[in-house]
């Protein structure tokens, strides 16, 4: 699979669309998940409605909203205030029970507003922090909330 | 096979300037921030600098904020540092690194280039 | 800045043995840190990241362990490769901050 470069810029929003087979995929759940390492596990961030038919609602988990059109084969991940912590690889992903089919492999860039002080110390603070699905989010005085990563795929 | 070679290390004087380059081959340079991270002789590991995949942003180390700049030529491959204002503090081991997805880790290093800032 | 603080600084063991070497951050890192090992003149090489994800090519003997503010490096039985500097670092979150060092010594 090829991987799709995305760009955003801090603070604002960013639309990643995973299309896919509509009749091959059908009745399969998606999800988003962030790849920890070339070869290694993939973290869930979220996945749509846990009732296939309503896959269409969004469903959010701390800054990171998913929705899938199943009849176009479109699925939707927004990823609201993009702060540079976010900036990574991930995968869409189609479920079929515990195994997971990536759709599509996507980089996130994170960009800051060069007219904001170049100052790396006042780059990392969010407003809103995302958190990982099945992850703790730990607060601290750094730049990102730390978000710990469970080593599972 | 990731491969990442430094070039441009040497002896300067103090207050003077030394352009660093890194050659990266094995993988989509592209699609990968790379940073630079230092070593003193016979002292750990201090990071330096990193950017982003298309070199749209850069971070820094305090240490170096305001006197190092780091760059990239995507088309070349190849990732860059221009030190200025030298101070023998910067003396050290400049090793060139390929940071995982924008994650703060380095999975391939470069061998080292050795900068000696003395007058 | 966090920092992260590394002990023993420096430790004699045998082939065979088995060895921990602790990581301590000044606040919370959740399970963000990565470990190196570097051998004398050479570049690091990166084992462990996210506390427990092998690298690529790590063999099993080496594991990694904690969160929050205390990690353990274990190497199960030491091979004779194994003797080299270890450095803990904090990733995830600018700046990425090393531990001193370990240096592992044979006994």
């Known amino acids: 699979l090829n991987t799709t470069v995305l760009q955003g810029m801090a603070g604002q929003s960013l639309r990643v669309s995973c299309t896919y087979d509509a009749l091959k995929h059908w009745g399969r759940r998606k999800a988003w998940c962030r790849q920890l390492g070339e070869e290694g596990p993939c973290q869930r961030v979220v996945s749509t409605h846990g009732v296939w038919l309503l896959a269409f609602l969004k469903k959010r988990n701390g800054s990171t909203v998913i929705a899938d059109d199943t009849l176009a084969g479109t699925v939707t991940i927004t990823l609201k205030n993009l702060q540079a912590g976010d900036a990574g690889l991930y995968q869409c992903q189609s479920l079929r029970g515990r195994e997971a089919e990536v759709l599509q492999k996507v980089l996130v860039e994170v960009l800051e507003d060069p007219l904001d002080d170049q100052d790396a110390g006042d780059l990392w603070v969010p407003e809103e922090s995302s958190s990982f699905e099945g992850a703790q989010v730990e607060h601290s005085t750094s730049r990102n909330q730390e978000t710990s990563f469970p080593p599972t795929s | 096979e990731v491969q990442l070679l430094e070039s441009g290390g040497g002896l300067v004087q103090p207050g003077g300037s030394l352009r660093l380059s890194c050659a990266a081959s094995?993988?989509?340079?592209?699609?990968?921030?790379m940073a630079w991270v230092r070593q003193a002789p016979g002292k750990g590991l201090e990071w330096v600098s990193s950017?982003?995949?298309?070199?749209?942003?850069?971070y820094y180390a305090d240490s170096v904020k305001g006197r190092f700049t780091i760059s990239r030529d995507n088309s070349k491959n190849t990732l860059y540092l221009q030190m200025n204002s030298l101070r023998a503090e910067d003396t050290a081991v400049y090793y060139c690194?390929?940071?995982?997805?924008?994650?703060?880790?380095?999975?391939?290093w470069g061998q080292g280039t050795l900068v000696t800032v003395s007058s | 800045d966090i920092q992260m603080t590394q002990s023993p600084s420096s430790l004699s063991a045998s082939v065979g043995d088995r060895v921990t070497i602790t990581c301590k951050a000044s606040?919370?890192?959740?399970?963000?840190l990565a470990w190196y090992q570097q051998k004398p003149g050479k570049a690091p090489k990166l084992l462990i990241y996210?506390?427990?994800n092998r690298f690529t090519g790590v063999p099993s003997r080496f594991s990694g362990s904690g969160s929050g503010t205390d990690f353990t490096l274990t190497i199960s039985s030491l091979q004779p490769e194994d003797f080299a500097t270890y450095y803990c670092?904090?990733?995830?979150?600018?700046?990425?901050?090393f531990g001193q060092g370990t240096k592992l010594e044979i006994k």
């Open positions: 606040q919370n890192v959740g399970n963000n």
């Open positions: 670092q904090r990733i995830y979150n600018s700046p990425w901050t």
């Open positions: 690194t390929r940071e995982w997805a924008g994650s703060g880790y380095f999975d391939y």
């Open positions: 950017l982003t995949n298309s070199g749209g942003s850069t």
């Open positions: 094995g993988f989509t340079f592209s699609n990968y921030y």
């Open positions: 996210y506390t427990s």
